[in-house]
């Protein structure tokens, strides 16, 4: 379990359980719609996701000199990934199937940001907008473009634990 | 197997409120949205909104908004819905459902509005 | 809001007769569009969802067609317990919008 104030992060189940996500954003996409994707979405959804980008301290140097930083940004993510993953655009219709890997995928958002931010220690969190509905029509191809991008999130995030659990664990 | 039963018929005065139960079972109630669709004596239906309970969202149809308040309480995997300042055509059945492509329905709550 | 016209809004057939029931939404709303049959006293049951997707236990007699505006619900073989009424709904866009119905009589 991550401690607050500074302290490492319980590196190795993070890496265990960014792994999971990495196997499950990929078994959840493409999600096989009703229709193909003949509609262009809003892109107001996707827009604003939050990447990891080189001034997070994701890097083996800004990990080993302060990893709070990288994991305040990856906290950030995993929380906004699981409030779409919540909301009307995957739950809504067109209906996922009961045995859709996005349950769990939602599930292991929540477990990993967990693991990261335990009670009674609070990271500011980047304001995630209140989420407007999205039509139905929209939303096969917010979900492959959300689950895309998911993708790209959570393969960064292992990359950054698995460097974590080799080197910086304790 | 899929079951979503709701609460008991209403009858209600002018001006008053009523809150409808929805209690859902055989699926795992935060994956899709509950809908609340209505029906006047002898009328067609009417969607009045949905919620999604995972995150807690809502869409409400602008004919009620202001009047129509939904809930959930996942730990019992139940919806609400209320609707404020009954009027006598609020007189209707209302009904829960879960995602449309999925035909799951509960049986309907008579609520009789009359002074 | 996207208007759902349905015709006719009644109809009377003999047990055997081909149904045919047309739904017209005054905007496109691609194949976005549920079929439901309601009987007296409960709630409606999908038969097509889609424009065209079967749904597992509806008897195969049931049939829909159509895209954009125009859709059809077809009844091969009118049977007794196909005496209701049957909706088609906007399933497109908000607000949901349903047909004003059409009721199947026995002539």
């Known amino acids: 379990r991550a401690v607050p104030g500074g302290s490492s992060p319980a590196w190795t189940q993070c890496q265990q359980l960014s792994q999971k996500l990495c196997t499950l954003a990929w078994s959840a996409h493409p999600l096989v719609g009703h229709m193909d994707l003949r509609e262009e979405g809003d892109e107001e959804t996707t827009n604003d996701v939050p990447h990891i980008q080189c001034g997070d301290g994701c890097d083996p140097q800004g990990l080993r000199d302060n990893s709070q930083f990288c994991l305040q940004r990856i906290h950030q993510g995993l929380i906004f990934y699981e409030k779409l993953l919540g909301s009307d655009i995957f739950t809504g219709e067109p209906s996922l199937l009961p045995d859709s890997p996005v349950g769990q995928l939602h599930a292991s958002l929540l477990g990993l940001s967990q693991l990261l931010q335990p009670e009674g220690h609070h990271w500011e969190t980047q304001q995630i907008p209140s989420l407007s509905p999205s039509q139905p029509w929209q939303r096969l191809l917010l979900r492959f473009k959300i689950l895309r991008s998911l993708q790209a999130f959570v393969a960064v995030a292992a990359r950054v634990f698995a460097h974590g659990a080799a080197t910086l664990s304790p | 197997q899929v079951q979503l039963v709701q609460s008991g018929a209403e009858v209600k005065k002018p001006g008053a409120s009523v809150k409808v139960s929805c209690k859902a079972s055989?699926?795992?109630?935060?994956?899709?949205?509950i809908k609340w669709v209505r029906q006047a004596p002898g009328q067609g239906l009417e969607w009045m909104g949905e919620?999604?309970?995972?995150?807690?969202?809502?869409i409400y149809n602008e004919k009620f908004k202001g009047r129509v308040t939904m809930t959930t309480d996942t730990s019992t995997s139940t919806a609400y819905m209320e609707l404020r300042s009954l009027r006598s055509d609020d007189t209707a059945v209302y009904y829960c459902?879960?995602?449309?492509?999925?035909?799951?329905w509960g049986q309907g709550t008579l609520v009789t509005v009359s002074s | 809001d996207i208007q759902m016209t349905q015709s006719p809004s009644s109809l009377s057939a003999s047990v055997g007769d081909r149904v045919t029931i047309t739904c017209r939404a005054s905007?496109?709303?691609?194949?976005?569009l549920h079929w439901y049959q309601q009987k007296p006293g409960k709630a409606p049951k999908l038969l097509i969802y889609?424009?065209?997707q079967s749904i597992s236990g509806v008897p195969s007699r049931f049939s829909g067609s159509g895209s954009g505006t125009d859709f059809t619900l077809t009844i091969s073989s009118l049977q007794p317990e196909d005496f209701a009424t049957y909706y088609c709904q906007n399933g497109h866009s908000f607000p949901y919008t349903f047909g004003q119905g059409t009721k199947v009589e026995i002539k």
């Open positions: 919620i999604f309970p995972r995150s807690g969202q809502t």
């Open positions: 459902a879960a995602n449309w492509d999925l035909d799951y």
């Open positions: 055989g699926y795992t109630f935060t994956s899709y949205g």
């Open positions: 905007q496109s709303i691609s194949d976005y």
């Open positions: 889609y424009a065209s």
